[in-house]
């Protein structure tokens, strides 16, 4: 079973080792959910063909997937720490449907889809601990998030599959830009 | 872009040693930094980086607790003090520029550390 | 941590031939990776970062590629400049390691 970080030996302080700094929890983390999504790409493209589409043609989707934008801060441009943190809290909480979409959506990878759902939410902790600027902080409606979750589940199953991938796709993407900006701070 | 190291030379082992980096050509606060040092004849060997606000701060497990890396970005400055210092210490010690993906896109000429009795 | 070990640790080559160096991570490292480059006595140099783009006033006879654990470094139409000792670094997980190195020499 895969096993989230903080849980393995390694994380736990060896008589010479110095316990993790905040920083290096949450680069841990992301890094950890990145080797998840990259195992349930993995399945998701042996059994579709979706991994083969173009970017163009997997864009036309209606899905509202949070995405970074020069405005959020958190590119070398415009960098500002403050609302970059408030954009990765905000857009992995946004994720956090999505994510509990992909929980039967996997066969063999069933448990690591768990585990990356479950490190994701360890990770907004993590996050709000070190925002400041928590007030700028928008927690999705539980009543919007139920009738997507029901709308992305009534679909047929060659939708499913392209969902699943454009998530798996766009978290993948989110992840990665959050990492490099927590890097920079 | 200008990087230059200094505070280099002779140290005795268990000896302490601060090196400097003066940066210049660029704004210094928008940039995380590196040290990277390399022994005579050796590789490359990856030491310390911090971020451009100093909240993050990564080390080396070789350098851990023994070297501390900071920064005064009003002066333009990186610092990397060492203590402890060993033998093994012994080598050139780079600072680079980080780009946004974290490599190195710019060095210094480096400074010569040698531990010795 | 992850190890990356580099090959060849040197090479002979002419100048107008071709060459690639590869380097292998001991575990996935999601494109993190950078190629430099280091002439005796000088400051390396970044070549690629993110596993293939170019870093700026690099000659486009250099290229990278790759992904997962393997990535290598082409050099097509070896130039007398282009000898030198090669580098790759990844900056996935700390400690963000260097490979040993690939010394490429004159034939």
């Known amino acids: 079973a895969p096993v989230l970080p903080g849980e393995d030996s390694k994380d736990v302080a060896a008589p010479h080792s110095q316990p993790l700094t905040s920083s290096e929890r949450i680069d841990k983390h992301i890094r950890y959910i990145l080797d998840g999504i990259s195992a349930l790409r993995k399945e998701t493209c042996n059994r579709s063909n979706m991994c083969e589409s173009s970017k163009e043609a997997l864009a036309e989707n209606n899905l509202n997937l949070p995405k970074m934008a020069e405005k959020d801060g958190c590119f070398q441009s415009g960098f500002n720490e403050d609302t970059c943190l408030v954009k990765i809290i905000t857009g992995l909480l946004e994720f956090e449907v999505y994510l509990e979409y992909l929980q039967n959506r996997f066969e063999s990878s069933e448990e690591q889809a768990r585990a990356v759902q479950m490190s994701t939410k360890v990770l907004i902790q993590f996050l709000q601990k070190k925002a400041k600027n928590l007030d700028a902080i928008t927690t999705p409606e539980p009543t919007t998030n139920a009738s997507l979750l029901t709308k992305l589940q009534a679909q047929n199953q060659w939708l499913q599959d392209m969902t699943t991938h454009l998530i798996l796709r766009s978290f993948k993407e989110f992840l990665q830009s959050s990492l490099r900006a927590l890097r920079q701070m | 872009v200008k990087l230059q190291e200094s505070g280099g030379g002779l140290v005795q082992p268990g000896g302490s040693r601060k090196l400097s980096c003066a940066a210049s050509g660029f704004t210094f606060s928008r940039f995380g930094m590196h040290w990277v040092r390399q022994a005579p004849e050796k590789g490359l060997e990856w030491v310390a980086y911090i971020g451009r606000g100093s909240s993050t701060i990564y080390y080396a497990d070789t350098v851990k607790g023994r070297f501390t890396i900071s920064r005064d970005n009003p002066k333009n400055t990186l610092f990397l003090q060492m203590t402890s210092l060993r033998s093994e210490d012994t080598a050139m010690y780079y600072c680079a520029r980080s780009n946004w993906d974290g490599a190195m896109d710019y060095w210094g000429q480096g400074t010569s550390v040698t531990v010795s009795s | 941590d992850i190890q990356l070990t580099q090959s060849p640790a040197s090479l002979s080559a002419s100048v107008g031939e071709t060459v690639t160096i590869t380097c292998r991570a001991s575990?996935?490292?999601?494109?993190?990776l950078a190629w430099y480059q280091q002439k005796q006595g000088k400051s390396p140099q970044l070549l690629v970062y993110?596993?293939?783009t170019l870093a700026d006033g690099v000659p486009s006879r250099f290229s990278g590629s790759g992904s997962g654990t393997q990535y290598s470094l082409k050099i097509n139409s070896l130039q007398p400049e282009d000898f030198g000792s090669y580098y790759c670094q990844h900056f996935w997980s700390t400690p963000w390691t260097f490979g040993g190195g690939t010394k490429l020499e004159i034939k």
């Open positions: 575990g996935n490292i999601h494109n993190f």
């Open positions: 993110n596993a293939e």
